[in-house]
């Protein structure tokens, strides 16, 4: 049986099926006879009882509150009440990234050593009976794998395996098609001592700004002690007194590597700061990785074609 939803704070992506399962479900004999209630409270409303009549998207089962699908306005606090038992969750529903096959904020990062066993299995036990098919994507390109019920990768890791792997489960419910996406950011690191340094996040970032305001561009990397991280922009950095590099911050990871962060601060943004590349580079003896930031006037963001947001 699917385990209960014990995390009190949950973030989910709009448009996907989602469920909350309370943790007193094992008291089956009590469930039959006891009054059970689900409530929601959000900014404007205090403790509104939920039932299938409150929304066609909501379904109630013995232990579970289901959303078909969850939407932005489902954000809020949820309560399950039965006798003297209460369980509370805070649900944050975030926007889907319409320009990618996954949403950046809902990515699980994993580090795998090169030549070590590397496995990705696409499975979803709760919705298993409803799933028609499942596809596995790497960097939003579909992988052709034999098993389309539970696609799996099992191999010894190579550097080329690095990337974003998305399991997409397609399922039907009440005549409608839904999908559930689970994405892993797989970083392949050197075996033994050194890792290949990698910058975290998308390679190209458009940042919406207003003229005259300030902006902080944060560049984060996973690197070795001897590696360096630096900003480069324009042919002559010397020409803009409003641009400042802040001190690099480093934290050691449990694996003995380093998580570094270096901020570029641009004050009193002018026209000359727009639509130019601000590049952050991490460098080691084994190679480099670079990510770019472009400042775009807030009003112009709508004009950027979707494809520039893909990695």
């Amino acid at each position: 049986a699917e385990s209960c939803t014990s995390r009190p704070h949950i973030t989910v992506v709009e448009g996907e099926p989602f469920y909350l399962k309370h943790c007193s479900c094992s008291l089956a004999h009590e469930i039959e006879t006891t009054t059970k209630s689900w409530y929601k409270s959000s900014g404007s409303q205090e403790h509104v009882e939920l039932n299938p009549r409150s929304s066609s998207r909501i379904a109630l089962h013995d232990c579970v509150l289901e959303f078909w699908p969850v939407e932005l306005n489902d954000t809020g606090s949820y309560f399950f009440q039965m006798k003297n038992y209460t369980q509370k969750w805070k649900l944050n529903v975030i926007r889907r990234n319409k320009h990618s096959c996954f949403t950046e904020r809902q990515v699980t990062s994993k580090i795998v050593e090169v030549k070590k066993f590397f496995q990705i299995t696409c499975e979803n036990s709760y919705y298993q009976t409803l799933v028609n098919s499942t596809s596995l994507y790497k960097n939003c390109k579909k992988l052709l794998l034999e098993n389309n019920k539970n696609p799996t990768i099992k191999k010894n890791a190579e550097f080329e395996d690095q990337g974003y792997y998305s399991c997409v489960h397609f399922l039907h419910h009440n005549g409608k098609l839904f999908n559930i996406t689970k994405t892993f950011n797989i970083t392949i690191v050197e075996d033994r001592s050194n890792i290949v340094p990698v910058l975290l996040g998308p390679k190209l970032n458009h940042v919406a700004v207003e003229l005259g305001k300030n902006v902080r561009l944060n560049c984060s990397a996973l690197l070795n002690e001897e590696d360096v991280i630096y900003w480069m922009f324009g042919e002559e950095n010397g020409s803009d007194p409003n641009i400042h590099e802040e001190k690099e911050m480093r934290i050691m990871t449990p694996e003995g590597k380093w998580h570094a962060s270096k901020v570029l601060r641009i004050e009193n943004i002018g026209e000359s700061n727009l639509n130019v590349l601000y590049n952050c580079t991490v460098a080691s003896t084994g190679g480099t990785d670079t990510k770019s930031f472009i400042l775009v006037r807030k009003a112009d963001m709508a004009d950027i074609p979707g494809h520039v947001f893909t990695r």
């Epitope: 001897e226 590696d227 360096v228 630096y230 480069m232 042919e235 002559e236 010397g238 580079t281 460098a283 080691s284 003896t285 084994g286 190679g287 480099t288 670079t290």
Partner: nanobody, 116 residues
Framework: EVQLVESGGGLVQAGGSLRLSCAAS????????MGWFRRAPGEQRELVAR????????NYADSVKGRFTISRDNAKNTVYLQMNSLKPEDTAVYYC?????????WGQGTQVTVSS
């Protein structure tokens, strides 16, 4: 494999000058854009100046603009850092390396100490 050797450091009074040199004892870096980094006690290495492979483009960190000058002599396979109006906060070990691009193995660096 390129072996980098930095020299020219020393102890100097605030306001004084030093000229650092970076040469390759093995191999060559004439085709590489190069930079000078420094590492103060308890800090990370920071890039203070860089120069393009031909020497036509130079860039400097805020903290050294107007005081430090990077140059190179490709015939001698050497990169220089002229440091004027030195301040106590310039105290660090100075290293050269390729910027941007994969790093060469770090040299021993050269210690610069600025007393007040």
């Amino acid at each position: 494999e390129v072996q980098l050797v930095e020299s020219g450091g020393g102890l100097v009074q605030a306001g004084g000058s030093l000229r650092l040199s970076c040469a390759a004892s093995r191999g060559t870096f004439t085709g590489d854009p190069m930079g000078w980094f420094r590492r103060a006690p308890g800090e990370q290495r920071e890039l203070v100046a860089r120069i393009s492979s031909g020497g036509s483009t130079t860039n400097y960190a805020d903290s050294v603009k107007g005081r430090f000058t990077i140059s190179r002599d490709n015939a001698k396979n050497t990169v220089y850092l002229q440091m004027n109006s030195l301040k106590p906060e310039d105290t660090a070990v100075y290293y050269c390396n390729r910027v941007p691009g994969s790093l060469h193995y770090w040299g021993q660096g050269t210690q610069v100490t600025v007393s007040s």
